[in-house]
């Protein structure tokens, strides 16, 4: 998971809306694993912004040491700064905790750019604005890092919420959420509402602002509108899903759907952008350029490098298309689509022009490791990570940024055949090579 910008074929597939409406599972099933309704104590417990990550306050050790921790569904280690670093205001001091236990084992996590390394241990952990429980969890005490912590981000560690298979140094290191569910009565489910501001926030505004909610153990109805639609978790490592069709302003990209998931598609709160496989990225950008052709932008903008600015309040949202991703549904031959607006994929950037300008970066980028549905996607939706039932739910977020003409949407069902063929089967090579490529 990166914290800046991270990220034999069969044709004729795809989820064209055929008019046929299949019966849809209601989202009010009695056997729902998580508590439903109101989680007042957890609402608004996240702060941050898409470009630097969303974080939750956690306490570690006895007496409790308070730290801000990045919420990352694209990794599986709970790792915290445990030594002085120029970008950290505070760090975990193991020697001050009476409940710290050293596991006498090191951990090293390299990324395409940057890395962190540290020492493994366990300690007591709680989430003040979360469930009223304390758990003993594995902690990687980060002693050295390079290009990992972000200056001004205000977080000091990372909470990897994915599965044990991608934990470091190996899958025997139990992730935090597994420990939480095992040691308490918290249901095996969490949900995220990431709220993009729609405008740049300076440091003090981020500290004062609400960034969203992480509801641990359930679903809060106040955080979304409409219905929740679920897609199966294909495999429990990353939160892997299957995309069956992609549309730009309703126009099908018409690619073999395997391309959309080459070599995987994941939901990752620790990545800023919507990252797409090379072929898909090129087709998508070509289509977005064509849709917005009344204005031209330099190549550096489409590469996510240059910013484009408009006079404050004059951003021409209407010239940019909506993007729809069709996801495999829970019912055979049924899919649903999630649609994001330019308000999600044009990311506001601060401190570059004058206050009379609104400036943006293009937040869709190329990936060599598959599709990554990062913060720009998640900011449009309330996303339910229903681990108990091996599925991920999407509903329109109550806090998503939109205008008077268009809104993000979650719609279905659509008839889509042969969706299983859209998944890519990664050749079983040394697993360690799969998890370091975070380009």
């Amino acid at each position: 998971t990166q914290h800046g910008i991270r990220l034999p074929l069969r044709s004729g597939l795809g989820g064209a809306p055929l008019g046929l409406r299949l019966p849809r599972e209601t989202d009010e099933e009695p056997e729902e694993p998580g508590r439903r309704g109101s989680f007042v104590e957890m609402v608004d417990n996240l702060r941050g912004k898409s470009g630097q990550g969303y974080y939750v306050e956690m306490t570690v050790g006895s007496p409790p040491q308070t730290l801000n921790i990045l919420v990352d569904t694209g990794s599986s280690n709970f790792a915290v700064g445990a030594a002085p670093h120029p970008f950290l205001h505070r760090y975990y001091q193991r020697q001050l905790s009476s409940t710290y236990r050293d596991l006498r084992k090191g951990v090293y996590v390299p990324y395409t750019q940057g890395k962190w390394e540290g020492e493994l241990g366990t300690d007591l952990v709680s989430i003040p604005h979360g469930p009223n429980v304390t758990v003993r969890a594995n902690i990687a005490a980060i002693t050295e890092s390079d290009k990992f912590f972000i200056n001004g981000s205000n977080w000091e560690g990372i909470l990897g919420l994915a599965y044990a298979e991608i934990a470091r140094p190996d899958d025997s290191l139990e992730p935090f959420f597994d420990s939480l569910v095992k040691q308490t009565h918290v249901p095996n489910l969490f949900s995220l509402q990431l709220c993009g501001a729609g405008f740049p926030l300076n440091q003090s505004e981020v500290l004062a602002s609400v960034g969203g909610s992480m509801i641990i153990g359930g679903i809060d109805h106040s955080l979304y509108t409409g219905s929740l639609w679920y897609t199966p978790i294909r495999r429990e490592w990353y939160y892997e899903v299957i995309i069956v069709r992609v549309e730009i302003n309703g126009q099908d990209l018409k690619m073999d759907c395997k391309e959309y998931n080459y070599d995987k598609s994941i939901v990752d709160s620790g990545t800023t952008n919507l990252r797409l496989p090379k072929k898909v990225f090129e087709a998508a950008v070509k289509s977005i350029k064509a849709a917005s052709s009344t204005e031209k932008f330099p190549d550096g903008f489409w590469l996510g490098e240059q910013l484009v600015c408009w006079q404050a309040g004059t951003t021409p949202w209407n010239i940019f298309p909506v993007i729809s991703l069709y996801l495999m549904g829970e019912v055979t031959n049924q899919s649903f689509r999630i649609t994001i607006l330019p308000q999600q994929y044009l990311r506001p950037v601060e401190d570059v022009a004058t206050s009379q300008d609104d400036c943006y970066k293009f937040a869709i980028s190329q990936s060599s490791t598959g599709t990554v549905m990062g913060a720009v996607i998640m900011e449009g939706f309330y996303v339910v990570f229903d681990r108990a039932r091996k599925r991920i739910g999407f509903a329109v977020s109550a806090c998503h940024v939109h205008d008077e003409f268009r809104t993000a949407a979650v719609e279905g069902p659509f008839v889509t055949l042969d969706m299983e063929d859209c998944g890519y089967n990664i050749p079983q090579t040394d697993e360690s090579t799969l998890m370091t490529g975070r380009a």
């Epitope: 009344t294 204005e295 031209k296 330099p298 550096g300 490098e305 910013l307």
Partner: antibody, heavy 120, light 108 residues
Amino acid sequence: QLQLQESGPGLVKPSETLSLTCTVSGGSISSSSYYWGWIRQPPGKGLEWIGNIYYSGSTYYNPSLKGRVTISVDTSKNQFSLKLSSVTAADTAVYYCARLGHGYNYFDLWGRGTLVTVSS
Amino acid sequence: EIVLTQSPATLSLSPGERATLSCRASQSVSSYLAWFQQKPGQAPRLLIYDASNRATGIPARFSGSGSGTDFTLTISSLEPEDFAVYYCQQVYVWPPRTFGGGTKVEIK
């Protein structure tokens, strides 16, 4: 070979509107490869970007000029124009029209410039 | 706002000498920077784009380097026609709007 030529009055009274035209010769203003822009330079001072236009009519303006600027294009005449309203002596400058090339990034071809003096 | 600061304001050199001009951005502009030359009574001329690429027809004695916040224009051996004012411009923020204040290269 493509050339740009500014034209318009060299003297404008305070509070009036400055109007300049840039004629493109040796090539089409309707090329999808370029934006067209205006830059000015007060006597003895540095360069200040005023704004750009694409042949479709899409415009970008310098916010510091506070809504006084209008740039328009006439593809049939292969021209684009600048209007700057409510001028003061501070608007006295050499006004250049230029082509924004190299992937819409750099002013790679300039007109000779025309001096506009704001004075009563 | 990104501010471009050029130094020195004036550089006094003799023909044949090496000229080194600096442009510093108040924050990173990646490699999205250009250099222009302006002679008295003339329009500016694009010399270098994308920090280090020479524009069409620009002699090899002109070279640009740098990325991020610090950029340099080097004229390896000054010719008489090189005495002029040089401006840098960033296009990291688009449309391109910010010019540096200029460096005057004068005959010593």
